[in-house]
């Protein structure tokens, strides 16, 4: 049996930060899990990671190059990245595995967020023309 | 909830080598880090060496590259640190730590748990 998991198909991040949600089709409460966010088309990098269990708070990880929080609902995590630059702009996907109580249980692939990433473009400062002369 | 139990340490000359185990028991992800560090007397527990899970991710502090070598038996759960060309500055007591993030974390504060740490002394 396995959890199915719901993403935006894409993001775009205009101010270098976006939220990404990540929704199950389980309930998180009262259980121990693994959250984590992977980044490229083959999942190689994972770049954020949060763990839950019952008597702990919640525990958010950020690969060193990623500035990552997360928050947990009750069947979703949503992962808020900031300070993002243009060339980490990519699919990313979510993953998620329950530990306990038994039995196991992890997600199907989903089909991933596209994040795209705007580059910050500088307003051209207004021309002043200087005094006229004559 | 993770345990750790570390062995492996003991006194050695200048020059000589040990080789550092840490077995870890309790509930497993698909993916986790496991990493050393050390603390000499007053001073800050430092970072040595980490290695994740899948093997494709590895880390080693400055001081230590080229002699010390981090690897691991997912079999046994087993982190090993071998560690060749050993200084009178590499005495510590070794600490073995596991974080859930994935990568070969260099953050002290990203482990969760700790092992009980075991003594390496190099002296003539």
């Known amino acids: 049996n396995k959890i199915l998991v719901k993403q935006s198909p894409m993001l775009v991040a205009y101010d270098n930060a976006v939220n990404l949600s990540c929704k199950y089709s389980y309930n998180l409460f009262s259980r121990e899990f693994r959250a984590s966010l992977h980044k490229g088309l083959d999942s190689a990098v994972e770049v954020c990671v949060v763990y839950g269990n019952y008597s702990q708070q919640l525990q958010v990880y950020s690969k060193t190059g990623f500035n990552c929080d997360g928050k947990l609902g009750n069947e979703s995590v949503t992962f808020y990245l900031q300070n993002l630059y243009v060339n980490q702009t990519d699919i990313y996907f979510c993953k998620i595995e329950v530990m306990y109580p038994p039995p196991y249980l992890d997600n199907e692939k989903s089909n991933g967020t596209i994040i795209h990433v705007k580059g910050k473009h500088l307003c051209p400062s207004p021309l002043f023309p200087g005094p006229s002369k004559p | 909830e993770v345990q750790l139990v570390e062995s492996g340490g003991g006194e050695v000359q200048p020059g000589g080598s040990l080789r550092l185990s840490c077995a870890a028991s309790?509930?497993?992800?698909?993916?986790?880090?496991m990493g050393w560090f050390r603390q000499a007397p007053g001073k800050e527990r430092e970072f040595v060496a980490a290695?994740?899970?899948?093997?494709?991710?590895?880390d080693y502090a400055e001081s230590v590259k080229g002699r010390f070598t981090i690897s691991r038996d997912n079999a046994k759960n087993t982190v090993y640190l071998q560690m060749n060309s050993l200084r009178a500055e590499d005495t510590a007591i070794y600490y073995c730590?596991?974080?859930?993030?994935?990568?070969?974390?260099?953050?002290?504060?990203?482990?969760?748990?700790w092992g009980q740490g075991t003594l390496v002394t190099v002296k003539p």
């Open positions: 309790g509930r497993m992800f698909s993916n986790y880090a």
């Open positions: 290695i994740n899970y899948r093997r494709d991710d590895a």
């Open positions: 730590g596991f974080t859930y993030a994935g990568w070969a974390s260099s953050r002290r504060d990203d482990y969760n748990y």
